[in-house]
């Protein structure tokens, strides 16, 4: 049965459509031609397409595909980018608060130790910030340096304030004594354990979010192969060559083509699912000593207790150190004077009243819930793209890549394609190098997330508050406790239910698809706004 002649015997409609893609009409035949040079839209009769038009269609098809892919990932990408920025900023705020709490503790309880103590505390928390951001710093060394620096000041100002000036040049000896005599008992070790566990988890959490952005960026900017371009052209544009301008591709046919084009991308699916589930497990374990907010905001109390421990043993220590450091002739050490106010951010010490209380942990859990709605993102991509490009409903009266059919049959379509292009070959090629690289990175972060030594999930008792604490107790596992009795100290029971200072008035609707990062407003107190809830078919 001969194919029906093109409805438009003059190729007029094809010309006007093609002009929108490519100004000028020199490549479009005025009337149907045999098209023997065509390589993609193989004609069954006269055609309104030329070889040059075919090339332009292929280019356009690949660009369309890239745009569809970018719009498919826009919401997910924005979700991760925004949260990575939010958490990084929030962690910085926690560190700043922790530093100010510690400085305030020194100012209120040990004014004679300031300003040197402020200096050492500042250096310690700077290192904490750098570590969270990925710097190659050893946490144990940070804590040791803090105590090594503090002890000489404690000894000369608190334990032995009557020391003559000539005896003040014993700092190195005192630093050594701090270690040899274990003057702070097990407090440095306690702080190391807590700080290293909580910072390690925080650091990997941020690393994981940044890798999530990298994964989306990689797949977002994939360049599709020429083979894929040919398949897309056959699906979207070859019908035009026959003058069938209003015909839509069959849905089933679209799925077959998309699965072929995206075979490499879909290979990410397994590792993406594992990434989200591993991240969820990490987040579920981020409490008590695995929660940097909890640990760092309690540090001032533990440091205070450690100084009290030294004071309690002052008699014995003074005698021993008197003998040990009697002949030290190290260079005299005098700290420059710093005004105390320089080190305490007054506004941080105000108790912030936040109407809609929101902790970092609730924010993390909210992020995980949203991410879980994207767990099938990669496996659902082919279907999503088909549902967001014109396809015929119910697979009736639609284009199957070669002709207009009453009903789409996958088998017939595959058979018809065999002599033009082998779909199976495309699938067999395997993922592109960039996809393989990102899969390797996902495997690596998944392994890191899994090997984090953390409690397996969280079961809260009815009596426990949202943070898993009961007053005066440490819940079901002492390992998760934070040290410090903090006699007479402010107790920071509520974590920074602050996210004060950190306002992100962002609406997904207004958000660009690319990497616009949110910037915090300067308000002293405000709360996070929920991300707009855009529901895509991927969810």
């Amino acid at each position: 049965q001969p194919p029906p002649p093109p409805p438009d015997a003059t190729c007029h409609q094809v010309r006007s459509f093609f002009q929108r893609l490519q100004p000028g009409l020199k490549w479009v035949p005025e009337t149907p031609v045999p098209g023997s040079d065509l390589q993609v839209c193989l004609p069954k009769g006269p055609t309104c397409c030329s070889r040059k038009m075919e090339e332009k269609y292929q280019l356009t098809a690949r660009l369309n595909m890239e745009q569809l892919l970018q719009s498919a990932s826009m919401e997910l990408k924005f979700l991760i980018i925004q949260n990575a920025a939010v958490f990084q900023e929030a962690f910085e705020i926690v560190v700043r608060h922790a530093k100010n709490y510690t400085n305030a503790m020194f100012k209120n309880n040990y004014p004679s130790l300031t300003p040197q103590a402020f200096e050492f505390v500042g250096e310690f928390f700077t290192d904490v910030s750098l570590y969270i951001l990925g710097s190659d710093i050893n946490v144990d060394d940070m804590v040791n340096e803090l105590f090594d620096s503090l002890f000489p000041v404690i000894y000369t100002q608190l334990m032995n304030p009557g020391l003559p000036d000539s005896a003040l040049d014993i700092n190195e000896c005192l630093r050594g004594a701090r270690r040899d005599l274990k003057v702070f008992g097990n407090f440095p070790k306690l702080i190391m354990t807590q700080v290293s566990k909580s910072l390690q988890v925080t650091r990997i959490f941020l690393q994981a979010l940044n890798l999530g952005i990298e994964v989306i960026n990689t797949t977002d900017h994939l360049k599709f192969s020429k083979d894929c371009g040919r398949m897309l052209t056959r699906m979207w544009y070859c019908s035009y060559c026959q003058g069938l301008m209003m015909v839509k591709p069959c849905g089933g046919y679209c799925n077959v083509v998309m699965q072929g084009c995206m075979a490499g991308v879909v290979e990410i699916d397994k590792y993406w699912r594992e990434y989200i589930l591993s991240l969820e497990e990490l987040v579920n374990g981020m409490y008590r000593i695995y929660d940097m907010e909890n640990v760092l905001l309690g540090l001032f109390s533990t440091i205070h207790d450690s100084i009290q421990y030294v004071q309690k043993n002052a008699g014995k220590l003074t005698t021993t150190i008197g003998k040990l450091c009697a002949h030290s002739q190290q260079r005299q050490y005098r700290s420059a004077y710093y005004p105390e106010d320089l080190f305490i951010d007054k506004k941080v010490l105000k108790v912030a009243h936040v109407e809609h209380e929101e902790t970092l942990s609730s924010r993390r859990r909210e992020l995980i819930q949203k991410l879980k709605s994207f767990i099938s993102f990669y496996s659902a991509l082919p279907g999503y793209i088909c549902s967001h490009s014109p396809v015929a409903e119910n697979d009736t009266l639609c284009w199957n890549g070669q002709e207009l059919v009453e009903r789409y049959s996958q088998k017939a379509a595959r058979n018809g394609m065999k002599n033009q292009f082998n779909l199976h070959e495309l699938k067999m090629k395997g993922p592109e190098p960039v996809v393989s690289q990102i899969i390797d990175k996902l495997k690596h972060i998944n392994q890191l997330l899994r090997t984090m030594s953390m409690p397996k999930g969280r079961v809260l008792d009815k009596n426990l508050d949202e943070e898993g604490f009961e007053s005066g107790d440490c819940g079901d596992d002492e390992d998760e406790c934070i040290g410090g009795s903090g006699d007479g100290m402010i107790k920071v029971k509520n974590q920074l239910r602050f996210l004060a200072e950190l306002a992100y008035d962002l609406d997904v609707d207004d958000a660009p698809g690319n990497s616009q990062q949110a910037t915090p407003k300067d308000n002293e107190i405000s709360t996070f706004h929920n991300l707009g809830n855009v529901h895509s078919p991927l969810k």
Partner: antibody, heavy 123, light 107 residues
């Protein structure tokens, strides 16, 4: 392999002093603390004191006035001396090592123990 | 000083059974707790430190746990060599103190 060998008298007269030497091998006293623990007949364990890798010492308060612990790193030996012994000081005395490297500068559990020295205080 | 209270004082069990020893600290010792086994006529041997970490060479049938100021040592599937006396000891602050011990006997 790691060993802690104790040597000392089995019998001490009341009001006399007890001296025990603990010689270690398989590790260095530069990064191990040596504790002394005793066990009275039919009783539990009692911690007496420790000499740390850096040379500092800590003692259990009831024994502070009559106990002295020192060491010679070059000979890998730790010396325990307790004065004014009474009958109720009769016990097995153990030396026990705990890691004390330049890492934590804190306290650790005792992972190596000597064979014990059985001491009887009697006239 | 921290007191360490061990319970029960003695316990009878058969090979293959599961037993649990408990040790309560009089204050917060921040997980700085060790468990030792002492067989008749022998020196104590470290089993667990930092409340939960098994010492080198200790079989996995031993496990330590913590809840508040109460610490536990659990042995599943008792073996003949597991019988003896078990002591807990804190190493949070000087003086380190031991519990009074739990004697595990063959039923």
């Amino acid at each position: 392999q790691v060993q802690l060998k104790q040597s000392g008298p089995g019998l001490v007269q009341p009001s006399q002093s007890l001296s025990i030497t603990c010689t270690v091998s398989g590790f260095s006293l530069n990064n191990y603390g040596i504790n002394w623990v005793r066990q009275s007949p039919g009783k539990g364990l009692e911690w007496l004191g420790v000499v740390w890798s850096g040379g500092g010492t800590d003692y259990n308060a009831p024994f502070i006035s009559r106990l002295s612990i020192s060491k010679d790193n070059s000979k890998s030996q730790v010396f325990f001396k307790m004065s004014s012994l009474q009958v109720d000081d009769t016990a097995i005395y153990y030396c026990a090592g705990n890691p004390d490297s330049d890492h934590y500068y804190g306290y650790e559990a005792m992972d190596y123990w000597g064979q014990g020295t059985s001491v009887t205080v009697s006239s | 000083d921290f007191q360490m209270t061990q319970s029960p004082a003695s316990l009878s069990a058969s090979v293959g059974e599961t037993v649990t020893f408990t040790c309560r600290a009089s204050g917060d010792i921040h997980n700085f707790l060790a468990w030792y086994q002492q067989r008749q006529g022998k020196s104590p041997q470290l089993l667990v430190y930092n409340a939960k970490t098994l010492a080198d060479g200790v079989p996995s049938r031993f496990s330590g746990s913590a809840s508040g100021t109460q610490y536990s040592l659990k042995i599943i599937s008792l073996q003949p060599e597991d019988f003896g006396t078990y002591y807990c000891q804190h190493f949070w602050t000087i003086p380190f103190t031991f519990g009074s011990g739990t004697k595990l006997e063959i039923k």
